[in-house]
Structures are given as C-alpha cells and as structure tokens.
Amino acid sequence: FERTRSLQDPCSNCPAGTFCDNNRNQICSPCPPNSFSSAGGQRTCDICRQCKGVFRTRKECSSTSNAECDCTPGFHCLGAGCSMCEQDCKQGQELTKKGCKDCCFGTFNDQKRGICRPWTNCSLDGKSVLVNGTKERDVVCGPSPADLSPGASSVTPPAPAREPGHSPQ
C-alpha cells in the first residue's frame, strides 16, 4: 500500500523538515528559514512561532518542530502551549481588572496566580483550628478532642487531647 501510495503521490516520500515543492516538479525541498514541518508529506512548511514581548523562547524552532514559548519573569503561562501570558501577583493576592489586590479577610492564595480561596471551615469536618489562616495560607485543622477520645476512629487510635492556648478563628 505504501509503495502504491508513493507511486501515486510523490509527496508522501517527503520527510519531516521538508515540503513537496510543486514549483520544482514535486521535489522535496527543505523548509526555508523560520519555518518547519513536523510530519512527512507536507505541501507547505508552517511559519515558526516567534516569542516576542512578554513571551520568551523556551525551545528554538527547528526544521521539524515549532518554537515553544514561556513567559518572562513576573508573568505566567495561560492556555494551551502558553498562548497567553498573565501577570503574576504576590502570594496573598489575586489578579483583578484593576491589577493585583490583597485577598479579603477569610480568604487566601498561596500562589502567584489564581484567585483567593476561602479558609477551610474546620468544624464542617469535625476538626478544630490549630493555626489561624492568613492571606497567604489556609488555616491548619487538627483533630478535635472528640476525635482523640478513646474509641474514636483514626489512623492510630490516640487518647483524648486538650488543645494548647490559641485563639480560635
């Protein structure tokens, strides 16, 4: 089948990094500079992506593969193949239309991207707050005295607990 196909279509013999040049009797010609073909049998080469402005070259274009971009410091990639760069914020902030804004009380963001999320409500899971939350970090929940009492189920059944002096949330 491959043999038949190549007799019918000489272009199928053109490997990646080349194109089937109709202007030159369907001879396989190398891709011109700043272009590539990642598969065989191509009739044209694709233009290489250029990483300009806020984009930075992560991988140079070759005759067989496109360039890959990432973002300059202070920005992070969004979308498939880093199609966009979005401004970083500090931990404890989120990006809004008006720029980076601090997380509201009761929310946190432990990354330079994304949105502020609410602190965990420990009591919903039957736990106690051991360490209060901040803008940059969630609260720390721990076993409540009931969880640590004899007969309560846990990974290694411990005895009852009494929490140290800390201010509950």
Partner: nanobody
C-alpha cells in the same frame, strides 16, 4: 498515606535538652500542618506544638519559650527541640501529619523521660 517514624527520645535530667525528629515516608508538603502530641501515663493526650506549611508555629502554654518546632518540606522531617526539660514533660511524644480534609496520620511515638 504518609508513614511517620519518631526518634530522639530517651532519659534526660531536669534542665537538659532533647531533639525529637519525625521522618515521613512521603511528601509532607501536601499536609497543612505537622504536629507533636504527647501523652503522660494517666493523662489525656495533648497538643504540644504545630507548624504550618510556611513555618508558622503554635505552642501549648506549658512549653512556650522552651520548645521549638520546625519542618523541612524538602527532607520531609519535623523536629521538636526541647530545652529546659521538666519532670512534667515526661510522656510519649507522637508526631502527626494534619490534612484539612481527610484523616490525620500518626506515628508510633517515642518515650521521653525527665528525671529530677
């Protein structure tokens, strides 16, 4: 679930120091808090100290100024530095890995005895 193994316990005279270490079998970075609990014979288990992912620590009033908890998210260890030990610090000290959602993982404990 992470496995925790404590070490460093032993017999020490009042006023002495010990350093307890808790080694985790896996990544502790995903745990919101790492803590040390203790239980003396006939007493309830009590929280001694807890350290959040960013190193923020809280202590029981009974150990404040004497004990220091720290965590190393790269080496997956949690240490408890215990100074100016008192006979009332005698207990089994147990390491715990705390997740805000899900169960708490516990070590088997290490005995600390402070003689007067």
């Amino acid at each position: 679930e992470v496995q925790l193994v404590e070490s460093g316990g032993g017999l020490v005279q009042a006023g002495g120091s010990l350093r307890l270490s808790c080694a985790a079998s896996g990544n502790i970075f995903s745990y919101n808090g790492m803590a040390w609990y203790r239980q003396a014979p006939g007493n309830q288990r009590e929280l001694v100290a807890v350290v959040a992912i960013d190193g923020t620590a809280k202590y029981a009033d009974t150990v404040k100024g004497r004990f220091t908890i720290s965590r190393d998210n790269i080496k997956n260890t949690v240490n408890l530095e215990m100074n100016s030990l008192k006979p009332e610090d005698t207990a089994v000290y147990t390491c715990a890995a705390l997740r805000n959602s899900g169960s708490t993982s516990w070590g088997q404990g290490t005995q600390v005895t402070v003689s007067s």
